[in-house]
Interface confidence: medium
């Protein structure tokens, strides 16, 4: 790598991948394996991020961009820059201090992370209950009973069962 | 990292409503439920109500069902805070707040904040 | 009313410890957040989940949970950590968030 001759500031020249070497009077030398620099002018090199553990290598670190990661199977990413993982629950399930635990009784979760939230209301848009909510699905609303031709009926399946005491004591 | 810029302070009269902007920098937001928190002068935190984005699904703090309304324009990646029959005691900063893990964490933390928009309500 | 109850105030030393503590029923499901606010700022996120720390949050704020109690602890105090402090959850009917009342630390 040549010296670089800025009068203003002679690490501005040197490019992503390289640092200002003040030991060796300002020359950019490339970064050390495990390292990278994203932006040009930089007198350090950053340490890559190693994905250890509960996270996986999505995109191995080179020497001007950092390594990204993801989770493993089970678990999901939150925070910036996958910063976290956090456990996957099964549909009909929400994370809390405790694990997994099934939605209560007028809630539902149709994905494998985040929380269990109200069944639709259909009556305040002036609907009927078209198919029942369960843990996993929402309920389903149809046309309002005066909506229905004579004779007609809408489908209402069996309430599910309440769940066994899931909310906070 | 996604930023929230919101729109500007606004003086209303008792009894109309006032419409509050939440602009997010990332297209990708509707991957983000997003928060509607206000915080009277003097006083502490209060939460109004959650929007997601991709489905338009909204809840609201029994104290304020009736009054306020969020939607959402995915085309400029903006939520919108409606609040309705306005007294004084809504004189306050209203904050539009996500958490950038993305999705309803369990935890219902938020990490990404609007500056504020200062509402005066006076006759 | 609030669902999470907080001291109104705590004053610490500076370089001493002080913890803070957020109570309500529906801690004993779910992991509180906690926020930092300074006059005129909106809030800060300092903690959530079991000790999590959002990153620029210096490791002398950390978070515990038992029961219906969640704390959160600033071992070190700075003059820079005078602020009010917030908890939030989700309510004890878990649809919906609730924030707590607040505690103004100040740093002697």
């Known amino acids: 790598f040549e010296r670089t001759r800025s009068l203003q500031d002679p690490c501005s020249n040197c490019p992503a991948g390289t640092f200002c070497d003040n030991n060796r009077n300002q020359i950019c030398s490339p970064c050390p394996p495990n390292s990278f620099s994203s932006a040009g002018g930089q007198r350090t090199c950053d340490i890559c991020r190693q994905c250890k553990g509960v996270f996986r290598t999505r995109k191995e670190c080179s020497s001007t961009s950092n390594a990204e990661c993801d989770c493993t199977p089970g678990f999901h990413c939150l925070g910036a820059g996958c910063s976290m993982c956090e456990q996957d629950c099964k549909q009909g399930q929400e994370l809390t201090k405790k694990g997994c635990k099934d939605c209560c009784f007028g809630t539902f979760n149709d994905q494998k992370r985040g929380i269990c939230r109200p069944w639709t209301n259909c009556s305040l848009d002036g609907k009927s209950v078209l198919v029942n909510g369960t843990k996993e699905r929402d309920v389903v609303c149809g046309p309002s009973p005066a909506d229905l031709s004579p004779g007609a009926s809408s489908v209402t399946p069996p309430a599910p069962a309440r769940e066994p005491g899931h909310s906070p004591q | 990292q996604m930023q929230l810029v919101q729109s500007g302070a606004e003086v209303k009269k008792p009894g109309a409503s006032v419409k509050v902007s939440c602009k997010a920098s990332e297209h990708t937001f509707t991957s983000y439920y997003m928060y509607w928190v206000r915080q009277a002068p003097g006083q502490g935190l209060e939460w109004m109500g959650i929007i997601n984005p991709s489905d338009d699904y909204t809840n609201y703090a029994q104290k304020f069902q009736g009054r306020v309304t969020m939607t959402r324009d995915t085309s400029t990646s903006t939520v919108y805070m409606e609040l309705s029959s306005l007294r004084s005691e809504d004189t306050a900063v209203y904050y539009c707040?996500?958490?950038?893990?993305?999705?309803?964490?369990?935890?219902?933390?938020?990490?990404?904040w609007g500056q504020g928009t200062m509402v005066t309500v006076s006759s | 009313s609030s669902e999470l109850t907080q001291d109104p105030a705590v004053s610490v030393a500076s370089g001493q410890t002080v913890r803070i503590t957020c109570q309500g029923d529906s801690l004993r499901r779910y992991y509180a957040g906690w926020y930092q606010q300074k006059p005129g700022q909106a809030p800060v996120l300092v903690i959530f989940?079991?000790?999590n720390r959002p990153s620029g949050i210096p490791d002398r704020f950390s978070g515990s949970s038992s029961g219906n109690t969640a704390s959160l602890t600033i071992t070190g105090a700075q003059a820079e950590d005078e602020a009010d402090y917030y908890c939030n959850s989700r309510d004890s009917s878990g649809n919906h968030y609730v924030f707590g009342t607040g505690t103004k630390v100040t740093v002697l």
């Open positions: 989940g079991k000790n």
């Open positions: 707040a996500s958490f950038n893990g993305g999705g309803n964490s369990v935890f219902g933390a938020l990490d990404i």
